[in-house]
Interface confidence: low
């Protein structure tokens, strides 16, 4: 359905509030260093222009594409070259190359200061003084730090942010009410950003074929009662939504997401019995709820898969007639029967099944050749099962902090070339899998753990792509999306790595250590641990544990001292010397 004016169409569909929010997010995700006021000015100009197009779709420039309109607007920023360097060259290009150029310059790790949370009273005053600006600032600050954040979902977070302030700024104990809500939004927001980043990486690096396969598996687990054709329709629509959002087409994405939610709620009977409570909610909440909805119950009478996919004499005929449909149906049938498997495992099984058919359908006796195909799945299933079991046991034995440290050592030995801040960030997040998944019942552990690990390892991949330092990381990140986690799991100590020279400065600490929060202290210690492993990659667990215990004791001692700085100055060099000895 073509419209004379795309901008007018989207403005009318989305309404002014969502239109302005999405344009602000789009601009903030593209120009991540621009000041807030500059973005607000640009958004207001675009909004005023959109209103003229709503009034008269034939007005000048109203027929231009959104990329043209938004790109032209971004290219009016006066300080583009000074602030962004070569990104300014994008403005010399024509659409669609200009938008592609802007997309390529999105920075997953922008050099922006961490967000500092002001005092509660200060925040509440700002909220009451100018609620609209306060919420726009939230959208801007999150979007510029997370340039692939799922835009319609960010509007939902902003609505929850607003609700938290509206409620808590009137409470007797504002801080007790507000701070847990803000912590929850922060943690959920980081998780949402990372999950969306994997979707975009999947689309951009491996194509929509890979994304569709992921979506078939996931939606078949969620909606096991839905027919294959229904799942296929949802997959096609979902792929369009995410392709648009990942491509910076945020207005189209939000509009199509709303249409998808409407379709799902109008067709609940043929999708899932779990959608009812989502469908009574307002739009943003409804879409979020549908995305997070729990798996429906599996139909009771599902027949064995072997009949159609192993025992049938028509397997090769059916495969040959429509390869993608046959594999898609296999994936659907397998996934709906296995909510206990991770999506990545299901995709590996589909890949293995495809490889077997490719080989066997060309053989003299195809049926004989593929008769044992399901037996070949066993090691693929057991590998993540064993991994989850071992790591959950380790997590329960060590607790989260020490489990993170074990992973820090493990991953630093595998890929010591990766920067220390990246290794600390990724290993800390890998370590959070324990608290997130190990408490769950057996049937939910693997999908929770492996699919979470895929999200975290994708963060390693996108950071590494920006500054590649390790061929091993590049190989694991680029060869196969579904085998990324097994690829990293299989990496051993890098024998070719030349240990980093010892630098005493890295292990010099000061009294400011004592005023850090518990989390900040952990990060300092974990940074030191990574540096130790980079210096002595072959250090044993016992050696490293000894050094870290000494480190904790040294910090505790000096933080209790009357003259803390003098203690750090005196005891620090002793600790460094002792550590070198311990690791010799």
């Amino acid at each position: 359905d073509t419209h004379k004016s795309e901008v007018a169409h989207r403005f009318k569909d989305l309404g002014e509030e969502h239109f302005k929010g999405l344009v602000l997010v789009a601009f903030s995700q593209y120009l991540q260093q621009c000041p807030f006021e500059e973005h607000v000015k640009l958004v207001n100009e675009v909004t005023e222009f959109a209103k003229t197009c709503v009034a008269d779709e034939s007005a000048e420039n109203c027929d231009k594409s959104l990329h043209t309109l938004f790109g032209d607007k971004l290219c009016t920023v006066a300080t583009l070259r000074e602030t962004y360097g070569e990104m300014a060259d994008c403005c010399a290009k024509q659409e669609p190359e200009r938008n592609e150029c802007f997309l390529q310059h999105k920075d997953d790790n922008p050099n922006l200061p961490p967000l500092v949370r002001p005092e509660v009273d200060v925040m509440c005053t700002a909220f009451h003084d100018n609620e609209a600006t306060f919420l726009k600032k939230y959208l801007y600050e999150v979007a510029r730090r997370h340039p692939y954040f799922y835009a319609p979902e960010l509007l939902f977070f902003a609505a929850r942010y607003k609700a938290a302030f509206a409620e808590c700024c009137q409470a007797a104990d504002k801080a007790a009410c507000l701070l847990p809500k803000l912590d929850e939004l922060r943690d959920e927001g980081k998780a949402s950003s990372a999950k969306q980043r994997l979707k975009c990486a999947s689309l951009q690096k491996f194509g929509d074929r890979a994304f569709k396969a992921w979506a078939v598996a996931r939606l078949s687990q969620k909606f096991p009662k839905a027919e294959f054709a229904e799942v296929s329709k949802l997959v096609t629509d979902l792929t369009k939504v995410h392709t648009e959002c990942c491509h910076g087409d945020l207005l189209e994405c939000a509009d199509d997401r709303a249409d998808l939610a409407k379709y799902m709620c109008e067709n609940q009977d043929s999708i899932s019995s779990k959608l009812k409570e989502c469908c009574d909610k307002p739009l943003l909440e409804k879409s979020h709820c549908l995305a997070e909805v729990e798996n429906d119950e599996m139909p009771a009478d599902l027949p064995s898969l072997a009949a159609d996919y192993v025992e049938s004499k028509d397997v090769c005929k059916n495969y040959a007639e429509a390869k993608d449909v046959f594999l898609g149906m296999f994936l659907y049938e397998y996934a709906r029967r296995h909510p206990d498997y991770s999506v990545m495992l299901l995709l590996r099984l589909a890949k293995a099944y495809e490889a077997t058919l490719e080989k066997c359908c060309a053989a003299a006796d195809p049926h004989e050749c593929y008769a044992k195909v399901f037996d070949e799945f066993q090691p693929l299933v057991e590998e993540p099962q064993n991994l989850v079991k071992q790591n959950c046991e380790l997590f329960e034995q060590l607790g989260e902090y020490k489990f993170q440290n074990a992973l820090l050592v493990r991953y630093t030995k595998k890929v010591p070339q990766v920067s220390t801040p990246t290794l600390v960030e990724v290993s800390r997040n890998l370590g959070k899998v324990g608290a997130k998944c190990c408490k769950l019942p057996e049937a939910k552990r693997m999908p929770c753990a492996e699919d979470y690990l895929s999200v975290v390892l994708n963060r390693l991949c996108v950071l590494h792509e920006k500054t590649p330092v390790s061929e091993k990381v590049t190989k694991c990140c680029t060869e196969s999306l579904v085998n990324r986690r097994p690829c990293f799991s299989a990496l051993e100590l890098d024998e070719a790595y030349v240990p980093k020279a010892f630098n005493a400065e890295t292990f010099t600490f000061h009294a400011d250590m004592c005023t850090l929060s518990e989390k900040e202290k952990q990060v300092k210690k974990q940074t030191a641990l990574v540096e130790l492993v980079k210096h002595k990659p072959k250090a044993t667990k016992e050696q490293l544990k000894g050094v870290m215990d000494n480190f904790a004791a040294f910090v505790e001692k000096c933080c209790k001292a009357d003259d803390k700085e003098a203690c750090f100055a005196e005891e620090g060099p002793k600790f460094v010397a002792a550590s070198q000895a311990a690791l010799a």
């Epitope: 074929r209 096609t236 040959a320 429509a322 390869k323 898609g328």
Partner: nanobody, 123 residues
Framework: EVQLVESGGGLVQPGRSLRLSCAAS????????MHWVRQAPGKGLEWVSG????????TYADSVKGRFTISRDNAKNSLYLQMNSLRAEDTALYYC????????????????WGQGTLVTVSS
């Protein structure tokens, strides 16, 4: 890097024949359905014909049915379009296109296009 290179276009009289070829590289050709799409001067894109990964499923636009034949040779990573009984209205730039849709049911997803080869039908 995915590459699709068309050849075989040229000037031909009405009623005559031409055979277009498309050489594919940079991907596993036999995993993908392929299509021909054309664009007449000053007009929009028009889908002409499509063929499944193994050649079992073939579809044509009504405007070319009975005159054009699509085929592929997976061993040679090549796609073909045999055009018979050409008409003036077949004059267009003909593109070879890869289809990345996971399913053949529903709409195809055209993810990679060649540069096109020009066919001019004129007396």
């Amino acid at each position: 890097e995915v590459q699709l290179v068309e050849s075989g276009g040229g000037l031909v009289q009405p009623g005559r024949s031409l055979r277009l070829s498309c050489a594919a590289s940079g991907f596993t050709f036999h995993h993908y359905a392929m299509h021909w799409v054309r664009q007449a001067p000053g007009k929009g894109l028009e889908w002409v014909s499509g063929i499944s990964w193994n050649g079992n499923k073939i579809t044509y636009a009504d405007s070319v049915k009975g005159r054009f034949t699509i085929s592929r040779d997976n061993a040679k990573n090549s796609l073909y379009l045999q055009m018979n009984s050409l008409r003036a209205e077949d004059t267009a730039l003909y593109y070879c296109v890869r289809d990345s849709s996971l399913f053949i049911v529903g709409a195809p997803t055209f993810d990679h296009w060649g540069q096109g080869t020009l066919v001019t039908v004129s007396s």
